[in-house]
Interface confidence: low
């Protein structure tokens, strides 16, 4: 209930997060024409990446464009990108769509298409579907770990939403273990409403709400989170527009003195911790 | 309309192999993804392989991972059905279909026969034991 008397101010917060967990990735691997099974291991810096702010990433799914180098090409025939003769390429032109800049030269892309050469990292990156089941799928099961300090300045006082009594293999759970601060992406999911299966191939924003109510009167204090979750981006976008969370990221190596990159589309889920509440003292 | 005509069933021993075509009528066939289906007396069709309209993506069935291979000609407007080391459960009636490209990333949806919008009149393949 809503104390009257009391002063309130917002909290103050800081969140630091470790995830933690092993994945075991099986998939289609292509050489020389031959395609095999490989297998991988990825382990939290396979998956993760460093976020500004209060924010942390798992990579569930990816598709990857290998042995690229700086050279020239013919572009992906997407729709619309197909030519006929060097007319339809305009040299010096980038197109937001293209992955390069037209030389003004129509070239065969295959046996049959024709498209625009462009200097590029080559090949260039085909429009490939995100994998189905999820390649990381398995990252269901990993934990984090969310270390949250808070401050009210207002009433000097500071807290942190680990106690020095708490269990380091604890997994939260809303009716048993609502303290514990470790948590199984796959039951953030549940708890969500969300299915981590079907989310994971796409990708997906998860929001990970902490609520602070303190009351910092010496006679009845209580000061402790109260962790509850939410899907943040908008599962019902259109499939053609975009949906889901992805970006793109680089593996640089040289092979024989030639400069080469891995270029790899990462699909994930973005966990953004929102710390919110307040403080109130006679 | 686009519309699809099978060919290349038959009757072929156990181990043998057959190689189904499915010819498109002229338009932009090369918009569309393609998929063959199978249906067996009494039972729902079922998927067996698809290719994307990029040509790029190819899916397969787990039953006949290894034994079948698709393959599209976008400038003959045809899908081909490699069938090899056929089986007598094999035997049924096959199906080509086309599923227009409505962009995103569909792939996992081509084994569904809701995202095909036209279909063939099915050739019949028969393996005998």
């Known amino acids: 209930s809503d104390k009257l008397y009391q002063r309130k101010e917002p909290v103050i917060s800081s969140v630091h997060t470790k995830v933690k967990g092993i994945a075991e990735v099986t998939e289609n691997v292509t050489e020389g024409g031959v395609t095999k099974l490989g297998h991988s291991i990825f382990d939290t810096a396979d998956y993760t990446f460093p976020l500004q702010g209060n924010s942390f990433f798992v990579m569930t799914n990816y598709v990857k464009s290998e042995g690229q180098v700086q050279t020239l090409c013919p572009e992906y025939p997407r729709r619309g990108a197909q030519c006929s003769s060097d007319r339809r390429c305009k040299k010096g032109w980038m197109d937001p769509q293209s992955k390069g800049i037209q030389t003004g030269r129509c070239v065969p892309y295959d046996k049959t298409r024709k498209t625009c050469e462009v200097s590029a990292w080559c090949p260039t990156e085909e429009e490939k579907e995100a994998p189905r089941p999820a390649l990381l799928r398995s990252a269901e099961n990993f934990t984090v770990l969310i270390k949250n300090n808070i401050h009210f300045p207002g009433h000097n006082y500071t807290t942190r939403n680990i106690l020095p009594t708490m269990n380091g293999s604890c997994t939260f759970h809303k009716t048993w273990d609502p303290q514990c601060s470790i948590f199984r992406l796959g039951d953030i999911f549940q708890e969500a409403g969300e299915n981590f299966t079907e989310v994971a191939v796409q990708g997906g924003i998860m929001g990970i709400e902490i609520y602070w109510d303190c009351n910092l009167d010496s006679w009845s204090h209580h000061c402790r989170p109260r962790y509850s979750f939410r899907r943040l981006d908008d599962k019902n976008t259109d499939e053609s527009f975009v949906p889901g969370y992805n970006f793109r990221y680089a593996k640089y190596y040289k092979e024989n003195n030639v400069e080469k990159r891995t270029l790899i589309k990462a699909f994930g889920i973005r966990f953004d911790i929102l710390v919110f509440g307040t403080g109130g003292k006679f | 309309e686009m519309q699809l005509v099978e060919s290349g069933g038959g009757l072929v021993q156990a181990g043998g192999s057959l190689r189904l075509s499915c010819a498109a009528s002229?338009?932009?066939?090369?918009?569309?993804?393609m998929g063959w289906f199978r249906q067996t007396p009494g039972k729902e069709r079922e998927f067996v392989a698809a290719?994307?309209?990029?040509?790029?993506?190819?899916y397969y069935a787990d039953s006949v991972k290894g034994r079948f291979t698709i393959s599209r000609d976008n400038a003959k407007n045809t899908v081909t059905l490699e069938m090899n080391s056929l089986k007598p459960e094999d035997t049924a009636v096959y199906y080509c279909?086309?599923?227009?490209?409505?962009?995103?990333?569909?792939?996992?949806?081509?084994?569904?026969?809701?995202?095909?919008?036209?279909w063939g009149q099915g050739t019949q393949v028969t393996v005998s034991s």
């Open positions: 002229p338009g932009t066939f090369s918009s569309f993804n």
């Open positions: 290719t994307s309209w990029s040509d790029i993506s190819t």
């Open positions: 279909a086309a599923g227009y490209y409505r962009g995103g990333y569909l792939g996992y949806r081509l084994t569904l026969e809701g995202s095909y919008d036209v």
